[in-house]
Interface confidence: low
């Protein structure tokens, strides 16, 4: 019996087609992805093949103005339209709190939403009961397939799930659910979840009875043969893991941003054992037409976005200096504003030991593309912020050793004075450079804001300590020459859309007046 698994993950609000790098579509003939194009391909496969499941491995939320405006209603609407069969909860599904998940998505989705390792407690338990499930048994043709969900146990550090959801260890939580499915005579089981490729592989290895793992979170691109676009494969598709009980378990992921549709064909024997698996992600490029009906729906929903982008978010009473001549040479108040917003967006998980789990931000000055003039009545709009941060990136959370941070700050000024983009703006960091010294030895003082303290203060950076830092995904991926970050990072979790982070902060503060205050000397 053959099953076709179509899968997406980390779509992050890319409802409309995008450019090849998943930013805003400029030249439509070269654009990719989007739900209208995805629908065309899915329907084509559904017609051609008898047993098809369309699955999403989480993080539909967060990433473009679509999420900012519609807050998840757009996810439910268009996933319903595409007739997804199941979705696993990702960490970003909690970005607007549990209410922001329940109302727009859990209550509106016409497909099961899954996570076996999230347990509700207290008053939330009854409110959320039945709205997401640990597993779901789906009829596919004349057979039955069990789908069991999982979500990153780091979610409390990455999003806003509140205090009434407990995120258990994935493997510990999955095993009893898989065992339960087995007792129900369900012998074909897919683990669908959002914990990253390393955890996906562990699940394949450790959870008895899981036949296939469909993952997300790490934006992993797997491919067999010559890849069709810019993404470099992290391994073959499917990636085969040998389980502890000797089975060959295929593990798949489909990069991110709806650029590819994962396509995996699995052959099962009559006892539900995987006999063979093969496939590849399908690049959703312009050779695949956009479905006109879905496209028309997208255009209808778009109208509200255009209106939103000109509305006032808040006011500034000072000039927001985002000029190249400032931000690529010295501390600039636009850099301070953005870093403050980045830290504010990550205020979570305080306890009696820590006032926050992260206190530091770095931001490449070249990523700041425009100032905002306060003389326009002080008004700040989404449109203004889109000019400052036009690349559609995210502000991510990484863990780095102090020694890596030191290298990053040396790189920041290794060719100082040429208006290059790598000059770092900061938050929760005090850095002193001596530009008379030779490149690679210019950082003379580097103090960082403590997190394990009741009164935050600046302490000297320790080379062997592990620090959490918020930074643009561009830097986490080694952009502007920050190869040491990419090579040496110990953990990387994707964060929220850059403009959204800043706009939320401005809306919260209402009136802003960021200063140049001696963070960089």
């Amino acid at each position: 019996w053959e099953l076709t698994i179509l899968h997406t993950n980390d779509v992050h609000s890319r409802l409309e087609q995008t450019s090849e790098d998943s930013s805003k579509c400029v030249n439509a003939s070269r654009c990719m992805g989007g739900v209208a194009r995805l629908f065309t391909k899915v329907q084509q496969i559904r017609r051609a093949e008898p047993n098809v499941l369309l699955l999403d491995a989480g993080d539909q939320y967060q990433g473009t103005i679509w999420f900012t405006v519609y807050k998840g209603a757009e996810v439910a609407h268009f996933m319903n339209a595409l007739r997804y069969d199941a979705m696993a909860l990702g960490n970003h599904e909690f970005d607007n709190g549990v209410e922001g998940l329940i109302e727009p998505l859990l209550k509106e989705a016409k497909f099961p939403i899954l996570s076996a390792n999230i347990k509700a407690k207290g008053p939330l338990a009854s409110q959320i009961s039945g709205l997401y499930l640990p597993y779901k048994v789906l009829p596919v043709g004349d057979e039955v397939v069990g789908i069991v969900g999982y979500t990153s146990k780091e979610t409390p550090f990455l999003s806003n799930p509140g205090t009434n959801l407990v995120f258990e260890d994935e493997i510990t939580a999955l095993q009893p659910e898989v065992d339960k499915l087995k007792t129900l005579n369900v012998n074909k089981i897919i683990a669908l979840g959002h914990s990253g490729f390393e955890t996906d592989k562990l699940i394949a290895q450790k959870v008895r009875g899981v036949d296939v793992v469909v993952g997300g979170h790490s934006n992993t691109f797997l491919y067999t043969g010559n890849p069709p676009s810019k993404e470099v494969p992290a391994g073959k598709y499917p990636f085969i893991v040998t389980s502890d009980d000797g089975r060959k378990v295929p593990v798949v992921q489909a990069y991110a941003f709806g650029k590819y549709l994962g396509y995996l064909k699995i052959e099962f024997d009559e006892r539900g054992n995987v006999i063979s698996s093969h496939g590849n992600p399908i690049l959703l490029n312009s050779s695949i037409p956009e479905d006109p009906s879905i496209k028309a729906d997208i255009n209808k929903w778009r109208i509200k976005l255009d209106n939103y982008s000109t509305q006032e978010l808040g006011k500034t009473i000072v000039y927001l200096d985002g000029s190249s001549q400032s931000c690529r040479f010295r501390e600039c108040n636009m850099g301070n504003l953005i870093c403050d917003a980045m830290i504010n967006n990550n205020l979570r998980h305080a306890d009696e030991m820590f006032w926050n789990h992260v206190s530091m931000c770095i931001l490449n000055g070249g990523g700041i593309r425009s100032p905002i003039d306060e003389r326009n009545n002080g008004t700040i709009t989404w449109e203004n912020l889109a000019a400052v941060l036009p690349f559609g990136g995210t502000f991510d959370l990484v863990q780095l050793k102090g020694s890596t941070l030191k290298k990053a700050f040396e790189h920041s000024v290794h060719r100082y004075g040429q208006s290059t983009g790598e000059f770092l703006q900061v938050g929760g960091i005090h850095v002193v450079y001596d530009l008379s010294r030779k490149p690679g030895d210019r950082v003379v003082k580097l103090d960082v804001l403590c997190t394990k303290c009741r009164v935050p203060s600046y302490d000297p950076l320790k080379m062997d300590e592990i620090y959490k830092v918020i930074l643009p995904n561009f830097l986490a991926n080694g952009g502007d020459g920050f190869q040491m970050i990419k090579d040496e990072l110990l953990r990387h979790d994707s964060g929220d859309q850059d403009i959204n982070v800043v706009s939320t902060y401005i809306s919260k503060m209402k009136v802003i007046y960021p200063a140049v205050e001696g963070r960089i000397k």
Partner: antibody, heavy 121, light 107 residues
């Protein structure tokens, strides 16, 4: 409110075809499957097939394969069921019924009022 | 194809009675089962789906149970408006067959 309104009764000769319409209102027509079910006098219900209006994808019960054709006109939110090569045992009330167009919870939640088709020489 | 067998085919009961109708599938339908009520000359009306979930607007005296191949519809206290014919339907694999029906009449 959400409703399905079917065309009127038909009398047909054996060997002829009949086309019954089902006009939807009060909801987004393209978001739900339309199914056809028939019921001979004093008998039970018999599922015939379904269509997903957004793209015209159909699935028919094997028993009716080759004789039944389900179509839609989305511009007027109407589904059609055509049954050909009619015989006397096709005399029945034919219902259209709306189904959620997604896996998860499956059921027919809204039904048309029924169309009586009589096949008689 | 999965066949659905309902029992009894007819049943006489009084107002206030507790009534149980069963539906047996020839194969496991994994709770993908709906119950409908039909009155003479009318279209069927959805009562329950997923074997036990009450449809919107249906009185709580109706309940469903079961799993695998055996399912039950229970009316805890019959009301005059409940006298009708009841059908089960599975949504496992096509064709989505109905049971033969149970006619519930006033004793």
């Amino acid at each position: 409110q959400v409703q399905l309104v079917q065309s009127g009764a038909e009398v047909k000769k054996p060997g002829a075809s009949v086309k019954v319409s089902c006009k939807a209102s009060g909801y987004t027509f393209t978001s739900y499957d339309i199914n056809w079910v028939r019921q001979a006098t004093g008998q039970g219900l018999e599922w015939m097939g379904w269509i997903y209006p957004r793209d015209g994808f159909t699935k028919y019960a094997q028993k009716f394969q080759g004789r039944v054709t389900i179509t839609v006109n989305t511009s007027i939110s109407t589904a059609y069921m055509e049954l050909s090569s009619l015989r006397s045992e096709d005399t029945a009330v034919y219902y259209c019924a709306r189904k959620e167009g997604y896996r998860g919870d499956w059921y027919f939640d809204v039904w048309g009022q029924g169309t009586t088709v009589t096949v008689s020489s | 194809d999965i066949q659905m067998t309902q029992s009894p085919s007819s049943l006489s009961a009084s107002v206030g009675d507790r009534v149980t109708i069963t539906c047996r599938a020839s194969g496991n339908v994994h709770n993908y089962l709906a119950w409908y009520q039909q009155k003479p000359g009318k279209a069927p009306k959805l009562l329950l789906y997923n074997a036990k979930t009450l449809a919107s607007g249906v009185p709580s005296r109706f309940s469903g149970s079961g799993s695998g191949t055996d399912y039950t519809l229970t009316i805890s206290s019959l009301q005059p408006e409940d006298f009708a014919t009841y059908y089960c339907q599975h949504f496992w694999s096509t064709p989505w067959t109905f049971g033969g029906g149970t006619e519930l009449e006033i004793k």
